[in-house]
């Protein structure tokens, strides 16, 4: 669901504004990195610096939910196994990949099994 604007109370009994409404962090260039967040309170506006992380893991956050297949067999050559995820639900404004591939190292047990299988195949 598209996130509602975060509402932040401005402290201090003497402050004119009781509640600031902050918009999303908008990167200054491209779709991640340093940018600005605009806040409004009555007729007042403020801009504060913010950062949208550029790491690939962003696609795996709450913005994008995937339905994953079971893990594939261990690849003895790379020592990893793979599974694919299909997009299940995206936040309205989140530009999620339709499918993603996740890899992880094989456990020592599956590594040994994969090596044993490889060895048998060579005989």
């Amino acid at each position: 669901v598209a996130k509602k604007k975060d509402k932040v109370k401005k402290g201090g009994p003497g402050s004119e504004c009781a509640e600031w409404a902050w918009g999303p962090c908008t990167p200054s260039s491209k779709d991640c990195g340093v940018g600005f967040r605009e806040g409004t309170c009555g007729a007042q506006t403020q801009r504060i610096r913010c950062r949208v992380p550029c790491n690939w893991k962003k696609e795996f956050g709450a913005d994008c939910k995937y339905k994953f297949e079971n893990w594939g067999a261990c690849d003895g050559g790379t020592g990893t196994k793979v599974r694919q995820g299909t997009l299940k639900k995206a936040r309205y404004n989140a530009q999620c990949q339709e499918t993603i591939r996740v890899t992880k190292p094989c456990t020592p047990k599956t590594k040994a099994k994969a090596k044993a299988k490889k060895g048998k195949g060579k005989d």
């Epitope: 669901v1 598209a2 509602k4 604007k5 918009g23 999303p24 908008t26 605009e38 409004t40 299909t86 997009l87 299940k88 639900k89 995206a90 309205y92 404004n93 989140a94 530009q95 999620c96 990949q97 339709e98």
Partner: antibody, heavy 117, light 107 residues
């Protein structure tokens, strides 16, 4: 690519209800938000609300909270919008559209609902 | 709710001319602004998403700018098939809202 085919035109009497369907084919129906938009004759576009087929999460324009009910049937890849207590002001073309922030959207051909006594 | 004001209401141009359509939001909507084209008897067609992102299958003469409160749709050289009504829509907060439209007509 997604194709959306809507049900045919309807003529209803004031006070009646109508259920408009929107059948999807092509890419996964259940992954994308389904919007409903209306357009009165000679007027602009007005957003009614949306539903996500994966869990039926619904967000309605408050203006339509007592007017529209959105549902989906995953088994047939069909979205439905039921309009109740129809009035002449509800005469409009009603559109469904499947939205993905990554690829954009696809629209149905529209369903004309005429409310007349 | 966020109000989108489009200007001009009507734009009269000849084919080959440059079209500049404006959409102003009542508050900052980041880049969550989309442009649609609608021809009589047809469903709207998405031209630009998120202020400036192009859409597959849409001619390169259509471009958009933003973000913030002031957005522009530019048609670099108007073709005969571009005469239609253009709407902007915001998806920054609920309810989603559309502008009142700009009618691009032949001069």
């Amino acid at each position: 690519q997604v194709q959306l085919v809507q049900s045919g035109a309807e003529v209803k009497k004031p006070g009646a209800s109508v259920k408009v369907s929107c059948k999807a084919s092509g890419q996964s129906f259940s992954s994308y938000w389904m919007n409903w938009v209306r357009q009165a004759p000679g007027q602009g576009l007005e957003w009614i609300g949306m539903i996500h087929p994966s869990d039926s999460e619904t967000i309605l324009n408050q203006k339509f909270k007592d007017k529209a009910t959105l549902t989906v049937d995953i088994s047939t890849s069909t979205a439905y919008m039921e309009l109740s207590s129809l009035r002449s002001e509800d005469t409009a073309v009603y559109y469904c559209s499947s939205w993905s922030a990554k690829r954009g959207d696809f629209w149905g051909q529209g369903t004309l609902v005429t409310v007349s006594s | 709710e966020i109000v989108l004001t489009q200007s001009p209401a009507t734009l009269s141009l000849s084919p080959g001319e440059r079209a500049t359509l404006s959409c102003r939001a009542s508050e900052s909507i980041s880049n969550n602004l989309h442009w649609y084209q609608q021809k009589p008897g047809q469903a709207p067609r998405l031209l630009i998403k998120y202020a400036s992102q192009s859409i597959s299958g849409i001619p390169a003469r259509f471009s958009g700018s933003g973000p913030g409160t002031d957005f522009t749709l530019t048609i670099s050289s108007v073709e005969p098939e571009d005469f239609a009504v253009y709407y902007c829509q915001q998806s920054n907060s609920w309810p989603l809202t559309f502008g009142g439209g700009t009618k691009l007509e032949i001069k």
